[in-house]
């Protein structure tokens, strides 16, 4: 059988074989892949990129969240989606997931001029059906994902908005447990709107095999700041492996190249 | 009170190691950073690296990251800092230090151990 | 990696006088600097964080200010016993860097 797919700090120190991420394979293995460097004065700017339009972020709901084995993931079922942004199209909410790291300066994938943060925060959309603009676009679609993502720093007061979802991580410790959050929004997990209003495009992959190469992404410029403790309650409270030996952290595949593609700014 | 108390002054012979450490008292251990720095006679303070020790994570200064290894003792809140192939470059006074927030300010430091590296 | 320069290495005061310190970054970070004084003999003591925010237990005259690549550390009456070197440090970018020193001496 083939080896399950992982990241680095899981085959370092467990004793089962895995796939780390310079051997994942097929799309892994491509040329328009995800995350990267983004240096902040070589993207352009883009007056198309204007303000997004968030639909059911503000509603209040009991999300269900699990641990994957790779993250701890919402499960938002399309009851929030987003349109605006530069982006062709409504895009419906499937989860939300993050990336991290037990130390301040590498949790997050992307990168800002070679700056990494405490963490990262991916929110995935999928392209509304029949709204695709051409034939060609609807059979083989570079778009079919949208991905917010918004790095996230230590600041030093507690996010309330992320109490919800630290809180619950003490109950999925395992994989495949799941468990329900108290009461929250989408939006209590963002910054301001007004810091919303600055962000880079460009044009790549899922960050995980398959690695599809049909993700047009969203990197906010402005951190999402967390406290040290909720930062670190993710470290501290998930395993990778159901006998708890290996703690989640460092759930981050290296930069990729950017290659000919070309970043663009709001 | 927090402290953190560090072993005392070393002689060592070029080209031995050496480990040093620094036990915290008054919070709770797994909580906070560890870094480590270094303090030349008459010079600047140099970061070394950190440590978390509740989950033995390491992060290096790239000028350090053949120099120095970080490591932590969680039952008797101790940090150690091991110092290998030494030679008179690495005679200073060498600190440790509690980190305030995730990634910023130091709030608390040790009293400092003292390494000279002679023949 | 993001430089720190302090300015001036030397400053001579005397008791009561009102001093300031320099700091400047080489680029922008925010008010992401914080102050230590480091008396001969001792280990650096925390005064002010990120930028301008007091520490509990440090005498009221210290104060700073400043934010982007241009930052100050104010004493509004020395005493003798703030002689002392006094370092800032940056922890907006990795590594953390701290300025080469002030030195804080009596006329």
């Known amino acids: 059988a083939e080896s399950h797919w992982c990241y680095e700090v899981q085959a370092e120190s467990s004793n089962y074989p895995c796939l780390v991420p310079v051997k994942w394979g097929g799309n892994c293995q491509k040329d328009r892949q995800s995350p990267i460097n983004i240096v902040t004065t070589k993207a352009k700017v883009d007056k198309k990129l204007g303000r997004f339009f968030f639909s059911g972020y503000d509603k209040k709901q009991t999300w269900t969240v699990q641990n994957n084995g790779h993250s701890v993931m919402m499960l938002l079922e399309n009851k929030a989606s987003i349109s605006g942004g530069g982006l062709p199209a409504p895009y419906q909410a499937k989860q939300l997931h993050l990336h991290w790291s037990d130390l301040p300066y590498k949790g997050s994938e992307h990168s800002l001029d070679g700056e990494h943060f405490a963490m990262e925060m991916h929110i995935v959309h999928e392209k509304e059906k029949g709204t695709s603009r051409n034939v060609k676009e609807a059979q083989d679609p570079e778009d079919e994902i949208a991905v917010l993502a918004f790095l996230v720093e230590a600041g030093t007061q507690v996010n309330e908005g992320f109490q919800p979802l630290v809180e619950a991580l003490s109950n999925i410790p395992k994989p495949e447990m799941s468990t329900t959050m108290a009461e929250s929004s989408l939006l209590d997990l963002l910054p301001k709107e007004e810091k919303l209003r600055h962000y880079f495009r460009y044009l790549g992959s899922l960050t995980t095999p398959t690695c599809d190469e049909k993700v047009v992404w969203t990197v906010f410029r402005e951190p999402i700041q967390l406290h040290r403790e909720q930062i670190l309650a993710f470290s501290q409270k998930l395993y990778y492996d159901k006998e708890q030996t290996v703690s989640m952290k460092d759930n981050v595949r290296p930069l990729q190249q950017l290659g000919q593609r070309t970043v663009i700014k709001s | 009170d927090v402290q953190l108390v560090e072993s005392g002054a070393e002689l060592v012979r070029p080209g031995t190691s050496m480990k040093m450490s620094c036990k915290a008292s008054?919070?709770?251990?797994?909580?906070?950073?560890i870094e480590w720095i270094k303090q030349r006679p008459g010079q600047g303070l140099e970061w070394i690296g950190v440590i978390n020790p509740g989950s033995g994570g390491t992060h290096y200064n790239e000028k350090f990251k053949d120099k120095a290894t970080l490591t932590a003792d969680k039952s008797s809140s101790t940090a150690y800092m091991q110092l290998s192939s030494l030679t008179s470059d690495d005679s200073a006074v060498y600190f440790c230090?509690?980190?305030?927030?995730?990634?910023?300010?130091?709030?608390?430091w040790g009293q400092g151990t003292t390494l000279t590296v002679s023949s | 990696q993001i430089q720190i320069t302090q300015s001036p290495a030397i400053l001579s005061v005397s008791p009561g006088e009102r001093v300031s310190f320099s700091c400047r970054a080489s680029?922008?970070?925010?008010?992401?600097i914080h102050w230590y004084q480091q008396r001969t003999n001792g280990s650096p003591r925390l005064l002010i964080k990120?930028?301008?925010e007091s520490i509990s237990g440090i005498p009221s005259r210290f104060s700073g200010s400043g934010s982007g690549t241009d930052f100050t550390l104010s004493i509004n009456s020395v005493e003798s016993e703030d002689i002392a070197v006094y370092y800032c440090?940056?922890?907006?970018?990795?590594?953390?860097?701290f300025g080469a020193g002030t030195k804080l001496e009596l006329k």
């Open positions: 230090a509690r980190e305030g927030d995730y990634g910023s300010r130091f709030d608390y």
């Open positions: 440090q940056q922890s907006n970018s990795w590594p953390t860097t």
């Open positions: 990120y930028a301008s």
């Open positions: 008054g919070y709770a251990f797994t909580n906070y950073l």
């Open positions: 680029q922008s970070i925010g008010t992401r």
